[in-house]
Amino acid sequence: IWELKKDVYVVELDWYPDAPGEMVVLTCDTPEEDGITWTLDQSSEVLGSGKTLTIQVKEFGDAGQYTCHKGGEVLSHSLLLLHKKEDGIWSTDILKDQKEPKNKTFLRCEAKNYSGRFTCWWLTTISTDLTFSVKSSRGSSDPQGVTCGAATLSAERVRGDNKEYEYSVECQEDSACPAAEESLPIEVMVDAVHKLKYENYTSSFFIRDIIKPDPPKNLQLKPLKNSRQVEVSWEYPDTWSTPHSYFSLTFCVQVQGKSKREKKDRVFTDKTSATVICRKNASISVRAQDRYYSSSWSEWASVPCS
Amino acid sequence: RNLPVATPDPGMFPCLHHSQNLLRAVSNMLQKARQTLEFYPCTSEEIDHEDITKDKTSTVEACLPLELTKNESCLNSRETSFITNGSCLASRKTSFMMALCLSSIYEDLKMYQVEFKTMNAKLLMDPKRQIFLDQNMLAVIDELMQALNFNSETVPQKSSLEEPDFYKTKIKLCILLHAFRIRAVTIDRVMSYLNAS
């Protein structure tokens, strides 16, 4: 058993049929010695008396808010949560496996630049009685500070018969140099509590590996005289690290119709303009990627050919 | 210690081409190592990230773009003495600060070159003959060093009398290649910045 926060405790249980469970001793936070009784949740049934209460925790029915009273007055509370371990593996029931970039990916993180600011998100099908708390650091043995905000519900989607909820959090490394060469990864830890179930999820990464620039901005087309060719130009996204001559991007320019299976014109360039062939009912799209360290491509910025 | 903005004329920067070749060569070699040594811990997640130049050179700080010198987190107190007669820019405008930057890059390359050559000598003794360093990568390091053209003491190639542990050598190769790729990215950024300034 360990303390998650004040008056909230996590009991780690090996979860299998007829498991013996864990013996837990609760102590009432009071100078009083006599006349103390214990109850669980909203029940008025007295579970025991005295300053300490010993319980055998085996299942979720044994978890919950234990309260010690004296003469009708509440003295203190202890909330017990369960953390299940099945076949030596901690449960991951609360969050959905996003399976990208690999299986067992519950947390996904992205950074728009090298400033040390990043966003992580996760998915769940649970809509109520759910809380998250996020901590982060650079390295684990001698951790350096990363400050994370509160996790918020950022999107809701319908997936077949189910509703899916996306939560996200923004974090900022306390003293980040955009030009630094990372040798210690960022560690992100998410505590998830659903009703009386506790789970924790972690992710470890270098900012350089989670870079995904914003799409290029200000796409403009200039038809070339006596030709089907069009000069398309764009600018670096505002959110990208500066100076741009140091933090350079490379671009992919594509002309394609509405369907992904349609024929296309595609060219890669390090410049902020390119010449492509425009077709009726097609769109010109441009996306960006770090020129020197190949992490993710940005989403496409698009303009219609016409 | 940073790069001033007033630097070379366009087309006066032979190092940019070499640095692009360097990044390409080390990325290819790293990819090859990850494929060939698939049963060894050779991915970014599996290895310890070590920097053999730590406390010996300070390329990131010495080559910091002017725009980032206002960022407290980018300024490191480490001081290293550098040789300052580089000719990469082929221009008399080479400032003292830039010379510090370029000589730091040169020292990095020299250190990695020695490490890679020592390691290759060991890998050539491996009866499995599983992996060797790409001669192209070693050649590209040499070309960039020549373009930088700094005089400095020759670092003797380390020779080891004991029987090499090939497993450890291959893991060390992965560690070295990951670190060198990151440094090659920095070098490419620096050269691009200097070329544009």
């Epitope: 089907r228 060719q229 490379t250 002309v255 299976r261 349609e262 024929k263 296309k264 014109d265 595609r266 060219v267 890669f268 360039t269 390090d270 010449t275 062939i277 077709r279 009726k280 | -």
Partner: antibody, heavy 118, light 107 residues
Framework: QVQLVQSGAEVKKPGSSVKVSCKAS????????LHWSRQAPGQGLEWMGW????????EYAPKFQGRVTITADESTSTAYMELSSLRSEDTAVYYC???????????WGQGTLVTVSS | DIVMTQSPLSLPVTPGEPASISCRSS??????LHWYQQKPGQAPRQLIA???QSISGVPSRFSGSGSGTDFTLTISSLQPEDFATYYC?????????FGQGTKVEIK
């Protein structure tokens, strides 16, 4: 499976024209660009131009501009390449090719040998 | 027009050994470079797209690298069926242009 079948070998006199056909099968004809390239005996490949059968848009290499005409007939899924004012140096194997990506070629025809000789 | 220069023009290789072919462009072309293989009396066949992207159905011993002006096609271990002529082609701008070809021959 996409296939391109080209017309047979031709022998032409200098100054005349040649029209090579290329019939496509497999897939929708207008879903692809069609390119024409050539290869002189023992020489490398030389790109001549492309057509978009959907709208008859074409682009020609400056070297052949004014001498080459590429057309496409959607009803028969056939593309044509006509080269006029033939000279002996136009002796080559002419290839049609089909691609979803405008700028590179993934499926080639078997080639048509055009010999220009007096 | 962008001029593509391949080297060497002839490459004698022992079967089972690796082979590398270089292709250089007169202007910087990013990764807009493609590789083809051609056997005598046959049409070319695509091997690599955009400098390093492998094509389905092409054996994994063929790999490409490079960007800007310098590109390499590598065959990790030459098989008897790999003896052929190899061409690079730039797609950065029209007209599309090919290298002169590199003939890989049995040593």
């Amino acid at each position: 499976q996409v296939q391109l079948v080209q017309s047979g070998a031709e022998v032409k006199k200098p100054g005349s024209s040649v029209k090579v056909s290329c019939k496509a099968s497999g897939g929708t004809f207008s879903d692809y660009y069609l390119h024409w390239s050539r290869q002189a005996p023992g020489q490398g490949l030389e790109w001549m131009g492309w057509i978009d059968p959907e709208n008859q848009d074409t682009e020609y290499a400056p070297k052949f501009q004014g001498r080459v005409t590429i057309t496409a007939d959607e009803s028969t899924s056939t593309a044509y390449m006509e080269l006029s004012s033939l000279r002996s140096e136009d002796t080559a194997v002419y290839y049609c090719a089909r691609t979803k990506e405008l700028r590179y070629i993934d499926v080639w025809g078997q080639g048509t040998l055009v010999t220009v000789s007096s | 027009d962008i001029v593509m220069t391949q080297s060497p023009l002839s490459l004698p290789v022992t079967p089972g050994e690796p082979a590398s072919i270089s292709c250089r462009s007169s202007d910087s072309i990013s990764i807009n470079l493609h590789w083809y293989q051609q056997k005598p009396g046959q049409a070319p066949r695509q091997l690599i797209a955009f400098a390093s992207q492998s094509i389905s159905g092409v054996p994994s011993r063929f790999s490409g690298s490079g960007s800007g002006t310098d590109f390499t096609l590598t065959i990790s271990s030459l098989q008897p069926e790999d003896f052929a002529t190899y061409y690079c082609q730039q797609s950065n701008s029209f007209p599309l242009t090919f290298g002169q070809g590199t003939k890989v021959e049995i040593k």
